[in-house]
């Protein structure tokens, strides 16, 4: 058993059945000794008397918030969460599996720049009694700050039968370096309680590897004098890092038809600008990359041809 | 540059740009390896890393170039040894057309034009990191590609920067 | 010396599960992946899935999923592999194997435990 | 899936001769500087044995009579001077995707 915050505690069980469960032993907060009764929730039935109360945890019906009381006063709560550990791994029913980049993964982070400013989100199917809390640091042994926002609800989705809940945290490196090679990794950590359960989930990344630019922005088209070909023009997004000299983009350019069957041309450049065949009924595209490091491209930039 | 004079900003800008293309070709971005293998205790941090005070950011560079330019030396010989060694000669073999190879001597092309015959820079040792099985082997060459490829990002920033803002 | 001891032949009814145990001793357990793999008889072999110790992550082939549970006791050094709901198709020779990292060949396996469903 | 096609199903092979298998991939098995595909021998009533790593790196305590080779899609296993106890069923193994498959095998006969 272990503190999560002031009167609340997590109780760790392994989870099969018949399993004996683990002794608890809750002390009331008072200076108090005699006289001292103990109930659970909402229920007026005495569990026991006494400063102390042993109870034995075994699931859910033994979690919850028990109250000493004492001629009718309430004395001190302990809140008892449960967390579940089923064949040696920790459960992770709140959170779902968003399976990309790989199975098991249930935090995604991205920064739009090395500012040390970034974004986790994760998706749950649950709508109610649900509570978050985030922590972050730079390193795990010697850790460095890192400042996380509160969690909130960021998106709802129907999914088939299903309604799915996005929440999303913004944090911040307190002492961020842009320029310097990271060597310890960003590790988030999300504490998730649904009802009476507790459940823990990480992710550790450099910020390096969450990278995805924002698109390039003002994307013009300049016709070329008696030519099909057109002048695309483009600027690096506002929030990317500067000076543009030092972190630098590369570029994607994309002349895609109407149909999605169309061959695609595709030109990569490092300029701002680019000379491309505009086709009737076409688009014209354009992703940003870090130059330098092969982290994630933005999402496209697009005009229509005409 | 030993003695404070300026690096050939363009050519190390070229160089070190092949640099970070020859990396990623040697260790693409994303293999199931690396979504099988992650949060592992084997770690690389005793690879020499540019850090924050190494002045190798955009005001670092215009107050004094050679601090910076000193730190990249030291890592670009660092792992050019380490891509000489058995860690990478030893089993399993690379392939015949690897990127190594080339990876290799453009290490040891920047690192001389950085510090041409007779100057010395002091240069980290290399720790004995060969590990006894191939697996073993084989990990330890992904994450020393992988730091590497984070080591020349950094690297090609500066001698973009540099050749954009501090070229004669 | 590294082994890979495997419970002993299981005949159960259809319908029915069963739980195959592989005790691994002379090795760092943690260190390698531990592989399941089926050979039904005069057959190749098929890839059940694996555990990677290394963040006790669990994967299955998808041909496998929902007959097969993979388990692991880290104190004993024990894998478990459980097949529920077990048809005629499931008589098989199932085999634990240690899986290297880095390139996941299977270097030393199990004698194997032979499994027979039928009434 | 990748699937691994081995050819011949069986091969007799005069003592000290050159034996040669074949297994060809359904895609590519490489990634960055290596071929993801191993291989393994089986005797009647044992498990498998590895013997080839990584498409052509001798396991350790394999004879060097073994050899493999290959590149991209097709792969070799040979085995020269072929010898008495080599009789065995030989299998190819993807790990470059996930599931991991095996060959269908090749039955070595030692005339």
């Known amino acids: 058993i272990w503190e999560l915050k002031k009167d609340v505690y997590v109780v760790e069980l392994d989870w099969y059945p018949d399993a004996p469960g683990e002794m608890v032993v809750l002390t009331c907060d008072t200076p108090e000794e005699d006289g001292i009764t103990w109930t659970l929730d909402q229920s007026s039935e005495v569990l026991g008397s006494g400063k102390t109360l042993t109870i034995q945890v075994k699931e859910f019906g033994d979690a919850g918030q028990y109250t000493c009381h004492k001629g009718g006063e309430v004395l001190s709560h302990s809140l008892l969460l449960l967390h579940k550990k089923e064949d040696g791994i920790w459960s992770t029913d709140i959170l779902k599996d968003q399976k990309e980049p790989k199975n098991k993964t249930f935090l995604r982070c991205e920064a739009k720049n090395y500012s040390g400013r970034f974004t986790c989100w994760w998706l749950t199917t649950i709508s109610t009694d649900l509570t978050f809390s985030v922590k972050s640091s730079r390193g795990s042994s010697d850790p460095q700050g890192v400042t996380c926002g509160a969690a909130t609800l960021s998106a709802e989705r129907v999914r088939g039968d299903n309604k799915e809940y996005e929440y999303s945290v913004e944090c911040q490196e307190d002492s961020a370096c842009p320029a310097a090679e990271e060597s310890l990794p960003i590790e988030v950590m999300v504490d998730a309680v649904h009802k009476l359960k507790y459940e823990n989930y990480t992710s550790s990344f450099f910020i390096r590897d969450i990278i995805k630019p924002d698109p390039p922005k003002n994307l013009q088209l300049k016709p070329l004098k008696n030519s099909r070909q057109v002048e695309v023009s483009w600027e690096y997004p506002d929030t990317w890092s500067t000076p543009h000299s030092y972190f630098s983009l590369t570029f994607c350019v994309q002349v895609q038809g109407k149909s999605k069957r169309e061959k695609k041309d595709r030109v990569f450049t490092d300029k701002t600008s680019a000379t491309v065949i505009c086709r009737k009924n076409a688009s014209i595209s354009v992703r940003a990359q870090d130059r330098y490091y092969s982290s994630s491209w933005s999402e496209w930039a697009s005009v229509p041809c005409s | 540059v030993p003695g404070g004079s300026s690096p050939a900003w363009t050519q190390c800008q070229q160089l070190s740009q092949k640099l970070c293309t020859l990396a990623w070709s040697a260790h693409p971005l994303v293999g199931h390896m690396d979504l099988r293998e992650e949060g592992d205790e084997e770690t690389t941090n005793d690879v020499p890393h540019i850090q924050c005070g190494d002045g190798c950011d955009p005001q670092g560079l215009r107050d004094n170039s050679q601090f910076c330019l000193q730190r990249i030396h030291q890592g670009l010989i660092f792992y050019e040894k380490l891509l000489g060694s058995d860690i990478f000669t030893g089993e399993p073999s690379l392939l015949p057309d690897s990127p190594v190879g080339q990876l290799h001597a453009s290490l040891l092309g920047l690192s001389q034009l950085l510090q041409p015959e007779g100057h010395h820079w002091e240069t980290q040792q290399i720790p004995s990191l060969s590990p006894s099985q191939p697996w073993q082997r084989l990990l330890l060459r992904f994450k020393i590609l992988r730091s590497l490829q984070a080591f020349v990002a950094v690297a090609a920033r500066v001698f973009a920067h540099g050749a954009a803002t501090l070229s004669p | 010396e590294v082994q890979l001891q495997q419970s002993g032949p299981e005949l159960v009814k259809p319908g029915a599960s069963v739980k195959i145990s592989c005790k691994a001793s002379g090795y760092t357990f943690t260190d390698y992946y531990m592989n399941w793999v089926r050979q039904s008889h005069g057959e190749s072999l098929e890839w059940i899935g694996d555990f990677n110790h290394n963040n006790d992550v669990i994967t299955y082939n998808p041909k496998f999923k929902g007959k097969v549970t993979l388990t692991v006791e880290k104190s004993s050094t024990t894998a478990y592999m459980e097949l529920r709901s077990l048809s005629s198709e499931d008589s098989a020779v199932y085999y634990c194997?240690?899986?290297?990292?880095?390139?996941?060949?299977?270097?030393?396996w199990g004698q194997g435990t032979s499994v027979t469903v039928s009434s | 899936d990748i699937v691994l096609t081995q050819s011949p199903a069986s091969l007799a092979v005069s003592l000290g001769q050159r034996a040669t298998i074949s297994c060809r991939a359904s895609k590519s098995v490489r990634f960055s500087d290596y071929f993801y595909m191993h291989w393994y021998q089986q005797k009647p009533g044992q498990p498998p044995k590895l013997l080839i790593y990584l498409a052509s790196n001798l396991e350790s305590g394999v004879p060097a009579r073994f050899s493999g080779s290959g590149s991209g899609t097709d792969f070799t296993l040979n085995i020269h001077p072929v010898e008495e106890e080599d009789a065995a069923t030989y299998y190819c193994q993807n790990s470059r995707e996930l599931p991991y498959t095996f060959g269908g095998g090749t039955k070595l006969e030692i005339k």
């Open positions: 194997a240690r899986g290297l990292r880095g390139y996941y060949a299977m270097d030393y």
